[in-house]
């Protein structure tokens, strides 16, 4: 089965009036920023800021633009050929294994460890053992074990929609 839909935000949206901008498919495909018509004879432009397509395609509709959640900032807006790019707010990050939400960065490393990497929108602070220099597994330590370094920015969890 082909995995087509990558967006998580899947509520039906109100469709604007049909676009008039049309062209003919090339070898059965329409260019980025377009989808194919029901009869396969025309390419119909996606609606700027509403939907998009990134590749040559024979999709019967354009994909819906992601909307950044609260707790995320918009790095670049949705165009007809590119989805919105959202990033976690300062002090939060998104892990590859839990991409649906921004998690708060830890404010410090466990006792016996030293911070070697800062909080970024895509990674928590990085801690290594003082002696061995091996990385910490990433489990959040118990509160009493935490050595505070710099205060983190509180942020509510944010769900990924793109």
């Amino acid at each position: 089965e082909s995995a087509l839909i990558t967006q998580q935000d899947l509520a039906p949206q109100q469709r604007a009036a049909p676009q008039q901008k049309r062209s003919s498919p090339s070898e059965g495909l329409c260019p980025p920023g377009h989808h194919i018509s029901e009869d396969g004879r025309d390419c119909i432009s996606c609606k700027y800021g509403q939907d998009y397509s990134t590749h040559w395609n024979d999709l019967l509709f354009c994909l819906r633009c992601t909307r950044c959640d609260s707790g995320e900032v918009e790095l670049s807006p949705c165009t007809t050929t590119r989805n919105t790019v959202c990033q976690c707010e300062e002090g939060t990050f998104r892990e590859e294994d839990s991409p649906e939400m921004c998690r708060k960065c830890r404010t410090g490393c466990p006792r016996g460890m030293v911070k070697v990497g800062d909080c970024t929108p895509w990674s928590d602070i990085e801690c290594v053992h003082k002696e061995s220099g091996t990385k910490h597994s990433g489990e959040v330590p118990a509160v009493e074990e935490t050595v505070t370094s710099s205060p983190g920015t509180p942020a509510s969890p944010c769900s990924l929609s793109g």
């Epitope: 089965e1 082909s2 087509l4 469709r15 003919s24 999709l59 509709f61 819906r64």
Partner: antibody, heavy 122, light 112 residues
Amino acid sequence: EVQLQQSGPELVKPGASVKISCKASGYSFIGYFMNWMKQSHGKSLEWIGRFNPYNGDTFYNQKFKGKATLTVDKSSTTAHMELLSLTSEDSAVYFCGRSAYYFDSGGYFDYWGQGTTLTVSS
Amino acid sequence: DVVMTQTPLSLPVSLGDQASISCRSSQSLVHSNGNTYLHWYLQKPGQSPKLLIYKVSNRFSGVPDRFSGSGSGTDFTLKISRVEAEDLGIYFCSQSTHVPWTFGGGTKLEIK
């Protein structure tokens, strides 16, 4: 395993409306169109239209506009078809069927429901 | 709408025989993209139709290789090389080149 499970038979009076359902399982519900077909007794099949669970769009065979209304409930991965102002001509077996979102592979139905028999009689 | 005409209406065969079903369309089914969107389904008694062949000659997954499709333009054929008991039922052709999509009237394959 892909399955489309339809609701049971219906006996309805002329002039009334009826809503039949098609529960999808075994695949990503939002990844395919849901189509509806009509098979009148001893006759061939007619394509009624299709619903796009991803964005809520519908596309109807002109013949069935005003007769059929297609909807889905994404939370229960169930497609519905409401048939309005019923007459004896609407008595038939109705099937749901899945098709792809792409033009080149979207014109055939790779999986079908078992059918729902509708009888319109006073 | 494109009218799909199937012949024969009924096809009595003996098990092991070859069967051939014809489907003719009122307009060419060759799309402007060069592809032909003609498909075949089998509906066994008391069941829903099942996809056999898509786009003239492509067997759907799990369909035995005794089924084959051919044709072009407006004339198409479904062949079953050696009919088995499980092949009995009504065969429908359908087209998706032109909107609305339409089906043939069906050919009933039965035991002679």
